[in-house]
Interface confidence: medium
């Protein structure tokens, strides 16, 4: 058969939950402390909550059925009677009463024909303000007749025909009634919720609703024009040219900011947006949803997309509607011919209308922002240059911030990219130019995206002119080649000598992508004599070992994930892992990761790595090979300085350093 409507699916679920109580029994959730009842869907059934309020489950006859004394459940179909009688069956006795008062209407309801009545519940009539009720029943009940006729359609309409966004023609001056049928199974009629649907009558069908509905005469734009509370919104809509859309056909939800909402915004922020056509359009579009959303349709958190493209979380807490968790809706369900308006008393400013400074102020990077401002870079954060700000998280500065000196200023300038980027378009090997004139590289890993040593820690925030990338550490631009880095740091003097003697200087000076696990002088000194001799006595072996310390791609710590097997220039793979923020290579911790170079990255280690081939065969017995002899002689001789041993000068240097 045809696919079931959401309402029918929910009803089916309620029937399923009630079947242990007998045939045609439906489980109903009632919000504690209210008379609000809902047929239950799966999610609500397990959560036992509606709009954050606890519910109790009760079991009632499903629509169209009734109990039989002495029998289980609701085995009997309700007897069919005319529409007037059926109003009583569904409990809409006040509608019956008012029907009687009109004199003309009861004969219609009892006579031939086919009609649909959206009958307000007794509570709905009772909740009408006294002056509204008085106006309905005065004027020889003409108003009452008109009001009731507006609740009627001149044919039978069942819920499976009630489609989302459709309009029905009422029996009052052919005025439209708006129908919305939501994915959660809730059906609304002019934003009144269907409580009991599809009660058949001999001459039609009755649907019980939770409000008295009235005709809709104005479009959204006209309502904005009429209401004093929308003075600022009115001006903004006019300036943006959105009035054409808001008075046209369609079905929208306008989350309409009141004057009070605009007044909550600091003057400069507001005036900047109102004076910028693009930002203004984005601001207003962020208050418009692509379809009509009645308050009654919200029974739990729901993600909705605005015309601007931002996702809002619309939810409810008891009787209050919430947006992004805040109860800012002051007046709900104002119906327009082209949608529905909810008054809100807080402005929803999208990222796309914000300056970099505003984006950053709302993120976990406020410490970095203060540094940028103190360094005199504030204009870049609030201006109209197309920029990307690489802002380290506050946690990066938990041990304090650097003093604002020339070095810090320069470092901060290198955290601002001269283009407005989006991380989804970044690619591996891409270079980005900073305000400080540096070229930064992009590294794309399986689970992270890094710029030099710093990786993106949160989704981009794209503002009016600038984009904010939240970074996991302070970015250090490369200052030279790997060889320059090693030569410039006296911890690596022995490594530098070894690289030179192994003929790898050229490799580590030229363009390339290397990850170098750099053993410190202490690492070399800690080598057992046998290892030391094997390393130093054979240039080929030395080169082999050193190549095992060099990966053939750039791997910064943020790109490691849990475990990466990195191919070395020697051929074997290095096992690089990250646990508790500590990088390890072959299970040995890295002392200092991520020293960036133009052709790679250096990770400082305090041990010399052994290729797999060297590990199993290793024997601890005494060895008297020529290299060891040379090493011993050189050690002794360099102390005594007596005779010349034929050693390459770099080895000589190495030996000298090993003694210290």
């Amino acid at each position: 058969g045809p696919a079931k409507s959401p309402y029918q699916l929910v009803l089916q679920h309620s029937r399923l939950r009630g079947r242990q109580h007998g045939p045609n029994v439906c489980a109903v959730q009632k919000v504690i402390g209210t008379n609000r009842k809902y047929f239950t869907n799966c999610k609500q059934w397990y959560q036992r909550k509606i709009c954050g309020k606890s519910t109790v489950i009760s079991y009632e006859c499903c629509p169209g059925y009734e109990k039989v004394p002495g029998e289980k459940g609701c085995p009997a179909a309700l007897p069919l009677s005319n529409l007037y009688e059926t109003l009583g069956v569904v409990g809409s006795t006040t509608t019956q009463l008012y029907t009687d008062r009109t004199e003309k209407l009861r004969p219609e309801m009892e006579g031939p024909g086919s009609f649909t009545i959206f009958a307000p519940s007794n509570e709905a009539w009772a909740s009408l303000p006294a002056e509204v009720l008085d106006s309905l029943v005065s004027n020889v009940n003409i108003e009452l007749l008109n009001a009731l006729r507006y609740h009627m359609v001149g044919r039978r309409v069942l819920t499976d025909e009630l489609k989302h966004g459709m309009t029905l023609t009422s029996m009052y001056q052919n005025s439209n009634i708006q129908i919305h049928h939501y994915p959660n199974g809730i059906v609304t009629v002019n934003c009144a919720r269907l409580l009991k649907a599809d009660h058949h009558a001999t001459n039609g069908v009755v649907h019980l609703i939770d409000k008295v509905i009235s005709t809709i005469t104005n479009n959204i734009q006209q309502i904005i024009e009429i209401e004093d509370t929308f003075e600022t919104l009115r001006a903004a809509v006019a300036a943006s040219g959105l009035n054409t859309m808001l008075e046209g056909n369609g079905q929208y939800t306008l989350l309409a900011p009141t004057n009070e909402a605009f007044e909550k915004i600091p003057s400069e922020t507001l005036n900047r947006i109102l004076g910028d056509p693009e930002a203004l359009r984005d601001l207003l579009n962020n208050h418009i949803l692509k379809s009509a959303m009645c308050a009654e349709a919200i029974v739990a958190g729901l993600s909705v997309e605005t015309l601007e493209g931002t996702t809002l979380e619309v939810g409810c807490s008891g009787d209050m509607l919430t947006i992004n968790g805040k109860a800012i809706i002051s007046n709900k369900d104002i119906l327009a011919t082209n949608g529905v308006i909810h008054y809100i008393d807080e402005l929803l400013i999208p990222d796309s209308a914000k300056t970099l400074f505003e984006l950053a102020a709302e993120s976990d990077v406020s410490t970095a922002i203060d540094l940028f401002r103190q360094a005199g870079l504030g204009n870049h954060l609030s201006g109209s240059e197309r920029l990307t700000l690489l802002a380290p998280l506050n946690s990066v500065f938990k041990d304090g911030t650097p003093p604002i000196d020339a070095h810090t200023r320069n470092l901060l300038r290198n955290h601002i990219i001269k283009d407005q980027l989006a991380s989804k378009y970044l690619y591996h090997g891409q270079t980005l130019e900073t305000l400080g004139g540096k070229k930064l590289r992009v590294f794309v890993y399986r689970n992270s995206l890094c710029i030099e040593n710093s990786c993106i820690a949160a989704h981009d925030k794209r503002g009016r002119y600038g984009t904010l990338f939240t970074m996991d550490r302070v970015l250090t631009p490369p200052m030279g080649t790997v060889m320059d880095v090693l030569k410039g740091d006296n911890r690596f003097s022995m490594l530098v000598a070894a690289i030179q003697s192994a003929g790898l200087t050229e490799t580590l000076n030229r363009e390339g992508v290397y990850t170098v696990f750099a053993p410190t002088n202490e690492a070399f000194r800690a080598l057992p004599p046998r290892e030391r001799s094997r390393l130093l006595g054979d240039a080929k072996e030395l080169a082999n070992i050193l190549k095992y310390h060099i990966g053939d791609e750039i791997l910064v710590s943020g790109g490691i994930g849990a475990l990466v097997r990195l191919k070395s220039l020697q051929g074997d793979k290095l096992e690089v892992s990250l646990k508790n923020n500590v990088v390890s290579v072959n299970k040995e911790p890295v002392a200092e990761p991520d020293i960036m170079a133009t052709n790679g990255v250096v990770h400082v280690i305090t041990n010399v790595l052994q290729p797999p081939a060297n590990r199993p065969q290793e024997r601890g017995d005494e060895l008297a090979d020529s290299a060891l002899e040379i090493f011993k002689q050189a050690s002794a001789f360099s102390r005594a300085s007596q005779r010349s041993v034929r050693l390459a000068p770099v080895y000589q240097k190495l030996l000298e350093r090993m003694k210290h």
Epitope: K264, S267, E268, R272, N379, L381, S382
Partner: antibody, heavy 120, light 113 residues
């Protein structure tokens, strides 16, 4: 370093006019919001007027609205305050002030002030 | 308009001792969107122009000694001087830059005992 030098103050009769000028140096003038703030003798500070970096947004205190006009000339790195229909209560030291950046905010740098006396 | 009220109006302090002054606004200066307080503090030394001390309610302007600190949120703010020095004398003003018209407090005059 940043320098703001006001000029144009003096003695004027009630109903008269004066034009204050402020010469700015040591920074990119066109990048900053600028303000006039005044201080009546022995009294506190009172914000008078604001002009945005591009001159688009202009705001006045109610007490001077319709009588004073703030303007700027980025080519000359100068800020102006045209004061018409002067009253005795306009007597004050007028400070030319630079904002923190092109984002309207607090008053970061102040000139030394120029004195305006309105008296018959 | 947002009204700024400072207290005390006069604050005599012994050098080396701490000092504290208060500023209250008639409406909240905390912008929920960025959790910033739109409040600044200034010092006007005798015969001089005012100078900026604190912005965002608590961020010290560069070059301002760390004995000055701003605190508070919403409508109640405090400026503290941990150890008053002779050069700190003058009138201290708080100012809101949340909404136009921007307004100042009437000032607290700090003097040496």
């Amino acid at each position: 370093q940043v320098q703001l030098v006001e000029s144009g103050g003096g003695l004027v009769k009630p109903g008269g006019s004066l034009r204050l000028s402020c010469a700015a140096s040591g920074f990119t003038f066109s990048d900053y919001y600028m303000y006039w703030i005044r201080q009546a003798p022995g009294k506190g500070l009172e914000w008078v007027a604001t002009i945005s970096d591009g001159g688009i947004y202009i705001y006045y205190a109610d007490s001077v609205k319709g009588r004073f006009t703030i303007s700027r000339d980025s080519a000359k790195n100068s800020l102006y305050l045209q004061m018409n229909s002067l009253r005795a209560e306009d007597t004050a030291v007028y400070y030319c002030v630079r904002g923190w950046d092109r984002y309207d905010s607090w008053f970061a740098c102040w000139g030394q002030g120029t004195t305006v006396t309105v008296s018959s | 308009d947002i009204v700024m009220t400072q207290s005390p109006l006069s604050l005599p302090v012994t050098p080396g001792e701490p000092a504290s002054m208060s500023c209250r606004s008639s409406q909240s200066l905390l912008y929920s969107s960025n959790q910033k307080n739109y409040l600044a503090w200034y010092l006007q030394k005798p015969g001089q122009s005012p100078q900026l001390l604190i912005y965002w309610g608590s961020t010290r302007e560069s070059g301002v000694p760390d004995r000055f600190s701003g605190s508070g949120s919403g409508t109640d703010f405090t400026l503290k001087i941990s150890r008053v020095e002779a050069e700190d004398v003058g009138v201290y003003y708080c100012q809101q830059y949340y909404r136009y018209p921007y307004t100042f407090g009437q000032g607290t005059k700090l003097e040496i005992k």
